[in-house]
């Protein structure tokens, strides 16, 4: 059951009156409460990235951020299921991988993420509006689909070469990351509430700004483990339209798995695939507090003024959102 913390809209105090500290003391418990209540929601991510080396090639990777075990992944392009999408590949953890032209190589990167390489079909560059979708069937969460497309501002000349990052199972990353953050957060929340009882609440001055001034809000990343899940890239050469758009793909029974060897999945087994890579230390709460300072009127040094709707060209390791929350 998905539950959300109902957080009242707080009016931010005037920066010069009560100061940022009073604001932070009031908002931080709500932030932590939202973290505590919303952390268990499964999330699907899709990454599409143009390669710097070849104008006609780009990268697609998909991952599932949840604690369940994945039973099937379907990759399509042209739109999601039911909206004209064409299936490119189906990956099963035990029965192997099935792919259709122009897909050349679909593979498991971790136990919860996959990558796909498509054959180029002569087009000089991919369309900016090509949509790739990944559908993850997992137990016990159910079926979840997400789509992504090439960022319109992608400039292959500016994109830095990808760097290897830790390969972690999403559930382990969740256990390590979310549990630690939540444990600390909930303890800190209790500590704050306790301290709050022992002293009078600071008086909030009514805001003198316009009625449309932004409210203070408690925000929280759906998964604290997102940052740990980036893995090396695979290349896709493709054109705007699938070469097999009018080809009917079999979706009926599992009979077509029969010819596939079980090792075809290339799915990493055991801890060897991820244990050797250190987990990056990230100051999640420092970022959260920076965000709170920014809302209170004090901009942290690394917080830029530009807020973008669609992607930040710095890549998936760029800070998630304008406030530096990961």
């Amino acid at each position: 059951m998905r539950t959300e913390a109902q957080v009242p809209a707080l009016q931010p105090p005037e920066p010069g009156l009560e100061g940022a500290m009073g604001h932070r003391t009031l908002v931080l418990p709500w932030v932590l409460l939202t973290l505590c209540v919303t952390a268990g929601t499964p999330e699907v991510w899709v990454q599409v990235r143009m390669e710097a080396t070849e104008l006609s090639s780009f990268t697609i990777r998909c991952g599932f951020l949840g604690s369940g075990s994945i039973s099937l992944v379907t990759v399509s392009w042209g739109g999601p299921n039911g909206a004209g999408g064409t299936t490119l590949a189906v990956l099963h953890p035990e029965r192997g991988i099935r792919q259709w032209a122009p897909a050349r190589q679909a593979r498991w990167e971790t136990q919860s993420s996959i990558s796909l390489i498509l054959e180029g079909s002569g087009a000089s560059s991919p369309c900016a509006n090509t949509t790739f979708c990944c559908k993850f069937a997992s137990f016990p969460e159910g079926s979840w689909e997400a789509c992504g497309s090439l960022p319109p501002s992608s400039d292959p000349g500016l994109s830095a070469p990808p760097t290897p990052a830790p390969i972690l199972r999403a559930d382990l990353a969740g256990i390590l990351g979310v549990s630690g953050v939540l444990l600390f957060g909930c303890v800190y929340l209790l500590h704050l509430l306790r301290r709050h009882k022992h002293r009078p609440a600071p008086r909030l001055q009514p805001s003198r700004t316009s009625p449309q001034a932004p409210r203070a809000r408690a925000w929280a990343p759906s998964q604290a483990s997102q940052a740990a899940l980036h893995v090396p890239y695979a290349t896709i050469n493709t054109s705007c339209r699938p070469a097999t758009l009018d080809t009917a793909h079999p979706h009926g029974g599992p009979s077509w798995w029969a010819s596939l060897p079980t090792h075809a999945a290339h799915r990493p087994q055991g801890p060897a695939a991820w244990a050797s890579t250190p987990i990056p230390a990230r100051g999640s709460f420092v970022s959260v507090e920076n965000g709170l300072y920014a809302q209170a009127g004090e901009r942290p040094p690394h917080t830029g003024p530009g807020l973008t709707l669609f992607p930040d060209p710095r890549g998936p390791r760029a800070m998630e959102g304008p406030l530096g929350v990961r």
Epitope: R2, E4, A5, Q6, V7, P8, A9, T34, T38, E43, V44, W45, V46, Q47, V48, R49, W144, E145, A146, C147, G148, L150, P151, S154, P214, R215, R217, A218, W219, A220, P221, S222, Q226, G291, G306, L307, T308, L309, F310, P311, D312, P313, R314, G315, P316, R317, A318, M319, E320, G321, P322, L323, V325
Partner: nanobody, 125 residues
Framework: QLQLVESGGGLVQSGGSLRLSCAAS????????MGWFRQAPGKEREFVGR??????????SYADFVKGRFTLYGNQARNTVYLQMNSLKPEDTAVYSC????????????????WGQGTQVTVSS
């Protein structure tokens, strides 16, 4: 100021499909997360799903009742977000609204800064 306009609603038979669109115009640079919510007659506004962008990666999450029936995705070139709804049920009847925020918010309506007017979806049995 940011404007959000929804479209694509209508009357559909149970088991059918609809695709809702939410087009953003104006200060689209002030958006970071876009969410869909719905409100059935006499009920509270309910979170459906949200999509957020970071670089070349799109993160999507949904409410539990979605159960794989709905897909949220965006056309980045056109500043448009879609909600593809399959296997619709009569209980999906509601006004569907899209919302945007400049902060990485969760599914709480109060956290969103900008709202569209909503589009009516009616599922008949």
């Amino acid at each position: 100021q940011l404007q959000l306009v929804e479209s694509g609603g209508g009357l559909v038979q149970s088991g059918g499909s609809l695709r809702l669109s939410c087009a953003a115009s104006g200060r689209t640079r002030s958006m970071y997360v876009m969410g869909w919510f719905r409100q059935a007659p006499g009920k509270e506004r309910e979170f459906v799903g949200r999509i957020k962008w970071s670089g070349d990666t799109t993160y999507t999450s949904y409410a539990d009742f979605v159960k794989g029936r709905f897909t949220l995705y965006g056309n980045q070139a056109r500043n448009t977000v879609y909600l593809q709804m399959n296997s619709l049920k009569p209980e999906d009847t509601a006004v569907y609204s899209c919302a945007a925020s400049k902060f990485p918010v969760s599914g709480v309506p109060e956290h969103y800064d900008y709202w569209g007017q909503g589009t009516q979806v009616t599922v008949s049995s």
